[in-house]
Amino acid sequence: ESLGWDIAELQLNHTGPQQDPRLYWQGGPALGRSFLRGPELDKGQLRIRRDGIYMVHIQVTLAICSSTSTSRHHHPTTLAVGICSPASRSISLLRLSFHQGCTIASQRLTPLARGDTLCTNLTGTLLPSRNTDETFFGVQWVRP
Amino acid sequence: ESLGWDIAELQLNHTGPQQDPRLYWQGGPALGRSFLRGPELDKGQLRIRRDGIYMVHIQVTLAICSSTSTSRHHHPTTLAVGICSPASRSISLLRLSFHQGCTIASQRLTPLARGDTLCTNLTGTLLPSRNTDETFFGVQWVRP
Amino acid sequence: ESLGWDIAELQLNHTGPQQDPRLYWQGGPALGRSFLRGPELDKGQLRIRRDGIYMVHIQVTLAICSSTSTSRHHHPTTLAVGICSPASRSISLLRLSFHQGCTIASQRLTPLARGDTLCTNLTGTLLPSRNTDETFFGVQWVRP
């Protein structure tokens, strides 16, 4: 572990209450193929424990979705991954809209610091799939 | 190689016969920019030779495709990446539908074990592109 | 640095003049969360300074875009990432069309050599977003 190979892959636990757009994550071998090796979960949000540059990746699929169902909804469904605390470092890192699709997937390299908590905000009124092969979120430490 | 830097990037060779949804892959410098360094191919399917956590990534583009052409077909075209053997470890790792798009692309971290064979199942009746910059599949060992 | 951990994450600076489909990138802490550690920029294009296998990733979002706005344009908007110089190594590495979506995102493993300059060509007449969480391009050295 001293090499700094911090890594995590999470599966969706649940969505937040109505006014909370955050997705709540869970991880651990008992749950399937998700795991936390270094980073930790704080009330379903991922907290970084080692400074460095990380590859952050995410895939979110909307539940019982077809291309017509996404176009039926007036408010665009958008997924944003960002640092939500500490407040002084709050920033959006990655943002995608579903438009007429049912899945978004992306990845990016970004510097993160010990104590950064990442939030994944799903705006709109569509429920994400909890299938572990359709919705997942992970980080991988790649260098100091 | 003893560091465990197993890595592979494959290009599409061909689709299976009608009742076989698997994509068959090929790799090697003679073919272009694809390669296998550690993992191996078994009848066009990727077999893992070292335990660890891997970043698995894939992009598949449908042949001669437009957003209108995908909507003309009744059965949704879906791509699933999973462990298909040994049967005791069979599981879907990553799944995406094309809906009105012509390309899917995603990636995820997942634990894999020596002997795991990964299959990429394309359901539906649309032919995938064989262009090497449009359809590819790869894995990268990232930590034990 | 001698370990070969070359890495870069870039943000969009500007598009080229009318007949130049290339996107022009910028990077550095003063600009936000973009950085160059090893690779360098040559007139907005990314130049590799170390041989190896790289993970190349990109996300491009079209500006003020909705799924109807992409379908209104006759010529498909396509993003291609390739080696553009030296000419002897010119090749397309990764290609995606927007179709009825507003964002493309993908990644792949590819061998790159010192001196390779990567170009990201956006064909079509739609302007990409310069928001740093919507449009970004990066490479990560992963092994020799």
């Epitope: - | 599409l12 009608q18 583009t61 449908l62 042949a63 001669i64 495709c65 052409s69 909507s71 003309r72 077909h73 009744h74 059965h75 539906g124 009746t125 649309l126 032919l127 995938p128 592109s129 064989r130 262009n131 090497t132 449009e134 359809t135 | -």
Partner: antibody, heavy 120, light 111 residues
């Protein structure tokens, strides 16, 4: 086994319409597309249009104003209608099944053909 | 529309010999790593029969005497050795885009 059986009139009056039914067996119209063609000594083999598995249709631009294709998947029938026929529409009309791959557009099975003469 | 030009319009070949038919497209029919050209055989009073798809793939049940090759704009159908039942008209068809178009046909006769 896969079959496409065509039925329709052999003689059509000028300016009248042509209706042909293609009844299929051995496969489902919710999975396969069916294309329509005609063959005449003057024009050779011409593609007229297609009805996809979803019921969406595409037509040859030269015939778009005169052609309609629909289907009843539950009865395994496709209905072809062309209006305002003229003597130069005299031809053998065929339905053909799109091969397994929906974006391949090669016909692996054909109907027996309906010979149509347009004459008064 | 893509125009397909077949040559020759007819040819006579002895049993056991090779028959070669060419098809040239007015623009490339290659895309997505495939060649979207197909070959059919038609005998009098019958509908066309698919022989070769995607330029070189033999349709199920078609004898290996039939083979196809080519890419971009130039394609070839070979029959070797020619047998008695091969007397027919052969057509090429592209499927690169709609509308689908056919060549005018090549009539193969046996000497």
């Amino acid at each position: 086994q896969v079959q496409l059986q065509q039925s329709g009139p052999g003689l059509v009056q000028p300016s009248q319409s042509l209706s042909i039914t293609c009844t299929v067996s051995g496969f489902s119209l919710t999975t396969y597309a069916v294309h329509w063609f005609r063959q005449s000594p003057g024009q050779g083999l011409e593609w007229l249009g297609v009805i996809w598995s979803t019921g969406i249709t595409d037509f040859n631009a030269a015939f778009i104003s005169r052609l309609n294709i629909n289907k009843d998947s539950s009865k395994s029938q496709i209905f072809f209608k062309m209006i305002s026929l003229q003597p130069n529409d005299t031809a053998i009309y065929y339905c053909g099944r799109n091969s397994y791959y929906g974006n391949l557009y090669a016909m692996d099975y054909w109907g027996q053909g309906t010979s149509v003469t347009v004459s008064s | 529309d893509i125009v397909l030009t077949q040559s020759p319009t007819s040819l006579a070949v002895s049993l056991g010999q090779r028959a070669t038919i060419s098809c040239r497209a007015s623009k490339s029919v290659s895309a997505s790593g495939y060649n979207f050209m197909h070959w059919y055989q038609q005998k009098p009073g019958q509908p066309p029969k698919l022989l070769i798809y995607l330029a070189s793939n033999l349709e199920s049940g078609v004898p290996a005497r039939f083979s196809g090759s080519g890419s971009e704009t130039d394609f070839t159908l070979n029959i070797h050795p020619v047998e008695e039942g091969d007397a027919a008209t052969y057509y090429c068809q592209h499927s690169r885009e709609l509308p689908l178009t056919f060549g005018a046909g090549t009539k193969l006769e046996l000497k």
